[in-house]
Interface confidence: low
């Protein structure tokens, strides 16, 4: 139903506090360069405002949509063309062209130093003297590095987190309770941002059916008993929400959430048995709880998938009067037979069972043609089954350090143009894959190994895209976003690449590395290791062992030397020279 | 061989009420949605009501909303449609339908389809 004013519709539903986050992401994820103060301050403008629209819909500006707002606090920022350049530019546009160009302007990888948690007691002091602005600054800085971040989800984190600190800060060992349990907080967020930066890109390149084909498929693994009208249902929800989420709609997304959690509620019956825990919750934790929902119990007396897909003699009539519709019930009845396949894989299928379709319908005898099209799926579900084994098999062997080092050493053979901090993170992220996944049931494996692996070739992709230097990059990037993986997963050693010279203050060392926390140290080796392949594209494995062994063996001694700058100075050399010659 | 059979159609008064049923035989019912369509003399049919195959999801078009209820009982293999506060504008043939797979409830999802029956509202 029409509001007269949008606003004071957004903040009755959302109420202040859910308002303010959100409003403050919003302008964190549009204005990334901006400080927390500068922001806050515009925040409680808008709500101040929003708060007279609440008590008079008929005040003046109050009928303006919110982009409109929004567009127009930004746009009175003073110095924006100084501290943004070009984004200024969007201000002289008109809704909704302005809110487009402020879209197309998010950076993926913002200038900003990385975010330093500070220690523990510190963190505790500032969280007690004033909670609410602490919690901002969390949204605030987690908003403006991932311009993504699905809003309503970020709100849910910042919980987390003020229920960790709560608990925490009470403690004697502030430290000992904080470090786990706001690791596995950031874990759990990093993650959730590069899932929705690809929900993201696949509304963006794709459209919005590529995005309802992903979500059919995810909804029917999870409810398996629900009809495929109301699987339509949930899926056509979803898109919207994330559509408008990602379209930075952010106070309208929440809101349909809040309205999709409930919806859900109210019909567990017709939806899946595993709600109700759930629905018993607040509703942030509600809607989160619903998205990691485990998948419902598939029923016992599921007929095969070929009699109303490959045997029945209507299929090329009932495909040519709906091939949306059809290839949508074709994706729903396979996915709920198939929670132990990954969304991609699922996609992957009603793809080729499309193309199947579309070739043997033209001919003359199409059932004789189609006939063989479940056999022909074997193929395409062994490949990622096979990457899932002997990656995890790897990960086993190597533990997650070697295994993300495997994996730095076969991405930069890979695309050796790429620059050396990007492969370190797409390595360190894909390494994550074993520990996230290879500990699991054998059953949840693919799905969550292939489901994540695309995830975090999408980051690379939208980094890579930003500066094009690897044409195979290009290509796997540029195709559909299900076969992405497959194509990263097929390139080989690229023969074009001229090797990097080396450059022997690539591979000088300070001893600053001996201060470094663990994480950093592990960059600072696997930086060495990416320079060390692009220098040497076919170096052996023992080869690249041999170095890097003796390269740890250094460090570790001037760490422990009296004199850690003079061991650095007169080793270092030493070891370069040992270097070049082991990898000549 | 499939068959579905329409029944309770009638004259009835402006405000009046009606029940059609609608009796399935030669279908697996309950993997079937249901679907009430109706075509007016010089009009092309439109889709009234329809329902999921376990009942639990529902459309109605707004035309119709809040004076028409669709229900089904699939032990009995018939679908219902109660329709209180009839308007002359109701007048039409009403023909129900059987989808094995129903999304958008556009005609083409519909599979098999009664021979209808006439309700007429006068005022």
């Known amino acids: 139903e029409a509001h007269k004013s949008e606003i004071a519709h957004r903040f009755k539903d959302l109420g202040e506090q859910h308002f303010k986050g959100l409003v403050l992401i919003a302008f964190s994820q549009y204005l990334q360069k901006c400080p927390y103060e500068e922001h806050i301050k515009l925040v409680q403008e808008v709500t101040d405002f929003a708060k007279t629209c609440v008590a008079d819909e008929n005040a003046e500006n109050c009928d303006k949509s919110i982009h409109t707002l929004f567009g127009d606090k930004l746009c009175a920022i003073p110095k924006l063309r100084d501290n943004y350049g070009e984004l200024a530019d969007c201000c002289a546009k008109q809704e909704p062209e302005r809110n487009e160009c402020f879209l197309q302007h998010k950076d993926d990888n913002p200038n900003l130093p990385p975010f330093q948690r500070p220690e523990a007691e510190a963190m505790c002091t500032s969280f007690q003297e004033n909670p609410t602005s602490f919690l901002g600054h969390y949204l605030h800085e987690v908003a403006r590095r991932h311009p993504y971040f699905y809003a309503p989800e970020l709100l849910y984190y910042a919980e987390k987190y003020n229920e960790v600190l709560t608990q925490c800060c009470t403690e004697s060992d502030k430290a000992a309770c904080l470090t786990p349990k706001l690791d596995a907080v950031k874990e759990k967020a990093l993650v959730a941002a590069v899932r929705q930066r690809m929900k993201c890109s696949s509304m963006q390149r794709f459209g919005e059916r590529a995005f309802k084909a992903w979500a059919v498929a995810r909804m029917s693994q999870r409810f398996p008993n629900a009809e495929f009208a109301e699987i339509t249902k949930l899926a056509t929800d979803l898109t919207k929400i994330n559509k408008e989420c990602c379209h930075g709609d952010l106070l309208e997304c929440a809101d349909d959430r809040a309205e999709l959690a409930k919806y859900m509620c109210e019909n567990q019956a017709t939806i899946s048995s595993k709600l109700q825990a759930c629905c018993d919750k607040p509703v942030l934790q509600k809607s989160q709880c619903l998205a990691e929902i485990e998948h419902d119990n598939i029923p016992a007396d599921l007929p095969s998938i070929a009699a109303d897909f490959v045997e029945d003699k209507e299929v090329c009539k009932n495909y040519a009067e709906a091939k949306d519709v059809f290839l949508g019930t074709f994706l729903y009845e396979y996915s709920r037979r198939h929670p132990d396949y990954s969304v991609s894989l699922l996609l992957r299928l009603a793809k080729k069972y499309e193309a199947t379709l579309e070739k043997c319908c033209a001919e003359g005898d199409p059932p004789a043609c189609y006939g063989t099209v479940l056999a022909e799926f074997q193929p395409l579900v062994e490949e990622p089954k096979n990457l899932v084994k002997t990656n995890c098999e790897l990960y086993e062997k190597l533990g997650e350090y070697g295994f993300q080092n495997a994996i730095l050493v076969r991405y930069t053979q890979k695309a050796p143009q790429v620059s050396t901090p990007t492969l370190v993170e797409a390595a360190r992220n894909l390494g994550r894959v074993g520990t996230k996944c290879c500990t699991l049931p054998e059953a949840q494996r693919l799905p969550c190994v292939e489901d994540y692996l695309s995830a975090i070739l999408n980051r690379l992709c939208v980094l890579h895209e930003k500066t094009p230097v690897s044409e195979k990059v290009t290509k796997c990037c540029s195709g559909s976003l299900v076969e992405r993986r497959p194509c990263f997963s097929a390139l080989t050693v690229d023969e074009t690449y001229v090797p990097k010279e080396f450059k022997a203050e690539t591979f000088t060392f300070h001893s600053d590395i001996c201060t470094l926390p663990d994480k950093e140290k592990q960059i600072k080796k696997q930086t060495a290791l990416a320079e060390l392949v692009k220098h040497k594209p076919k170096a052996t494995e023992d080869q690249l062992k041999t170095v890097m062994g003796d390269f740890a063996q250094f460090v570790d001694k001037c760490c422990k030397a009296a004199d850690k700058d003079n061991c650095f100075a007169t080793e270092g050399p030493n070891l370069v020279a040992r270097s070049k010659e082991a990898l000549a | 061989e499939v068959q579905l059979v329409e029944s309770g159609g009638g004259l009835v008064q402006a405000g009046g009420s009606l029940r059609l049923s609608c009796a399935a035989s030669?279908?697996?019912?309950?993997?079937?949605?249901m679907g009430w369509f109706r075509q007016a003399p010089g009009k092309e049919r439109e889709r009234v009501v329809s329902?999921?195959?376990?009942?639990?999801?529902?459309y109605y078009a707004d035309s119709v909303k809040g004076r028409f209820t669709i229900s089904r009982d699939n032990a009995e293999n018939t679908v219902y449609l109660q329709m209180n506060s009839l308007k002359p504008e109701d007048t039409a043939v009403y023909y129900c339908?059987?989808?094995?797979?129903?999304?958008?409830?556009?005609?083409?999802?519909?599979?098999?389809w009664g021979q209808g029956t006439l309700v007429t509202v006068s005022s």
């Open positions: 030669g279908l697996t019912f309950s993997s079937y949605a």
């Open positions: 339908a059987a989808a094995r797979y129903w999304a958008t409830g556009s005609e083409y999802e519909f599979d098999y």
């Open positions: 329902i999921s195959r376990g009942g639990g999801y529902t």
